[in-house]
Structure formats: structure tokens, C-alpha cells
């Protein structure tokens, strides 16, 4: 065998069983651990790059990664690994994560394009909304491309609608 271990990282435990569960997802005990952005293919007997299958029907094992990859292809959006959702930068400009810096900084130069709430935020009138449902929580489990924690950010109902649209 040659070439199969090139992208593996050390320190991951592996077990001897290699099988698929009925749903096509790897079963907890029976799967081998793979580096992030890879999955265990039991027929091939190796870890495979999720990138290779994002264009195929068989995305079950890499659904989150593929959503993230597709999201990053869209301008003005980023994938939040905590929310597991594709977030529109337009909805959070003003207190945006670094992934939205380019988009928001260009947007903020022409505030006419911003929704009223964000124009108010831009001029210092941050809404005092006690509903924490839209708050971004920091997480140590985020992927390397996840947004930084934004504990102070609260989103209005309108903004949440944009975030989840």
C-alpha cells in the first residue's frame, strides 16, 4: 500500500472494525477516526477527503463539510460551525466575524445599501434587545475556519430571519 496515509494526522485512535451502518453513516464504535475534513470509507479501507465527494449524491458522511465548502463559495456568506449554518454577512455587518470583514467593510462604505437596523448600529445606536436567542456562543469545538466568539452580538428578529434565510 502506498500513498494512503499522506494526509493523516497522528494521535487519532483507530479500531479494527470497518463497517457502514444501515443509514450509511459510520457507526460510533465501528468507524475509524479520520482527520477533519475526511471520512472513513470502509470499502476502500482508508480515510478519504470529503472534498472528493461534495459533488456526488453520496454526501451523507460529509454533509457538514460539504455545506461549509459550498457556503464559502458564495460571496458575502460564511459557514458558522457552531450554528451549522450558512450565514449571510449582510445580516451581521457592524459586529461581524473576520470572515465577513471584506464584505462588510465594502458595504459599510455605502450605508445606503444596509438595512435600517445596521445603519443605526453603524451610527452607534445599537439596539438593546434582551432576547439572547440570536447570540453567538464561543465554542472550543469549532473548525479552523469558524468565526470567533462574538459574545456581545445580539440579533433582532429581522436579522435572524436574514441569518437563517
Amino acid at each position: 500500500m502506498s500513498g494512503l496515509g499522506r494526509s493523516r494526522r497522528g494521535g487519532r485512535s483507530r479500531v479494527d472494525q470497518e463497517e457502514r451502518s444501515p443509514q450509511g453513516l459510520w457507526t460510533g464504535v465501528a468507524m475509524r477516526s479520520c482527520p477533519e475534513e475526511q471520512y472513513w470509507d470502509p470499502l476502500l479501507g482508508t480515510c478519504m477527503s470529503c472534498k472528493a465527494i461534495c459533488n456526488h449524491q453520496s454526501q451523507r458522511t460529509c454533509a457538514t463539510f460539504c455545506r461549509s465548502l459550498n457556503c464559502r463559495k458564495e460571496q458575502g456568506r460564511f459557514y458558522d460551525h457552531l450554528l451549522r449554518d450558512c450565514i449571510s454577512c449582510a445580516s451581521i455587518c457592524g459586529q461581524h466575524p473576520k470572515q465577513c470583514a471584506y464584505f462588510c467593510e465594502n458595504k459599510l462604505r455605502s450605508p445606503v445599501n444596509l438595512p435600517p437596523e445596521l445603519r443605526r448600529q453603524r451610527s452607534g445606536e445599537v439596539e438593546n434587545n434582551s432576547d439572547n436567542s440570536g447570540r453567538y456562543q464561543g465554542s472550543e469545538h469549532r473548525g479552523s475556519e469558524a468565526s470567533p466568539a462574538l459574545p456581545g452580538l445580539k440579533l433582532s428578529a429581522d436579522q435572524l430571519a436574514l441569518v437563517y434565510s
Epitope: S2, G3, L4, E18, R20, D41, P42, L43, H56, S58
Partner: antibody, heavy 118, light 107 residues
Framework: QVQLVQSGAEVKKPGASVKVSCKAS????????MHWVRQAPGQRLEWMGY????????KYSQKFQGRVTITRDTSASTAYMELSSLRSEDTAVYYC???????????WGQGTTVTVSS | DIQMTQSPSSLSASVGDRVTITCAAS??????LNWYQQKPGKAVKLLMR???RLHSGVPSRFSGSGSGTDFTLTISSLQPEDFATYYC?????????FGGGTKLEIK
Amino acid sequence: QVQLVQSGAEVKKPGASVKVSCKASGYTFTNYVMHWVRQAPGQRLEWMGYILPYNDGTKYSQKFQGRVTITRDTSASTAYMELSSLRSEDTAVYYCARYDWEGSFDYWGQGTTVTVSS
Amino acid sequence: DIQMTQSPSSLSASVGDRVTITCAASQDISNYLNWYQQKPGKAVKLLMRYTSRLHSGVPSRFSGSGSGTDFTLTISSLQPEDFATYYCQQGNRFPPTFGGGTKLEIK
């Protein structure tokens, strides 16, 4: 449409090597794993090995380990299977097959007959 | 390696007949069982993946069932073009393994 076209029949002497080619068309060659499977007369299909689409990684059946080498030329969308130290029991039809990522082989080449005879 | 046992090894039938071929795995393979059709001098064709999902272009007279270790391929009404050899293959464990084949002949 997806097509895998293999090279023509070969007759080899024991101890020699054979290299079979498989030209792919109708899809992005580097998006799929290519496998090689053989079938000796009157025998079942037998998996030999595969090559990964993105880093030339290979994995072989223990039975053929050390005798088989699978390579590819991405610019020509072609995969190759070379079997060395041929013996009479290697007389078989050799197939390339595309892996569909879900445990099955969705497209196969037409097969290449290799005859090993002194 | 997982052993795949197909039965019968050969079968004679007539056009219009309903035919069933079975495949048994030596250990649980969930639903990762595929069926292929092979005709002399032609490329092997995938008929069915994941026990019962027809591959594109395969007629609906072919159906599959089973789970775990026991599986069947059924042809509801044999057509002249269906006379061929059929193979099962497990896609659940490395390395992939195939059944011994069932040769379907005209009676």
C-alpha cells in the same frame, strides 16, 4: 456519457509483465477512485486494487501485493494496471471499474484479455 | 474477507418467467449489497446498488431485497436481453468481494 475504454488483448510469456490501460471519458477523471478487478476462466470476479483520484494513493489486494502497480496519467484521463512475474494462473480478463463512493462500481471497462502461455 | 455465496450457480428459465437469485454474506453487511450483470464480451453493468436502488437506465422489472446477510435479486418477467451472468458484491467492508455468479440461460 461515462465510458471506460481498455487496451487490447495481450499474450505474454511466464515471468513477463503486462500493462493494461483504461481511458476514461464523460466525467472528471480526478473525482473518482479507479479500481481493477480480474476474472480468470470459470472463476468469480476478484478485486486487485485501486488508485485514489487526488493524490495517487494506491491500495492492493494482499494476493497481488508486490506484483501489481496501479498508476494514472491525469492529463490523459487514463489509469494503468501493471502485473509482473506473470504465471499461467494470471490468464484472465482484467477490468477497470469506477467507484461510485457508495460501495459499488458504477461503470466498467469492456475488459482486457491477458493470456500467459509459454 | 467477507465471503459471498450465490445460488443457484446456474438457472434455466423462459421469457416471461419470474426469476429469483439469492446471495448470502458470511457476516452482516447491512444493505451494502450490489448486483451486476455480465454478458460475454461486454462490459460488466451495475444493476442495483444498496440492495434495492436501481442504477440509471435499469428497467423496473429488476428488484432487490434483503438486509444483513441474505439478499435476493428478482426479475419479474424475463426478457430475451436478461439472459446473462449475475454477480452480487458486498460494499460494506474492505476488500470488496463478489459472489460466484449465477448464469441465467434460456430453457
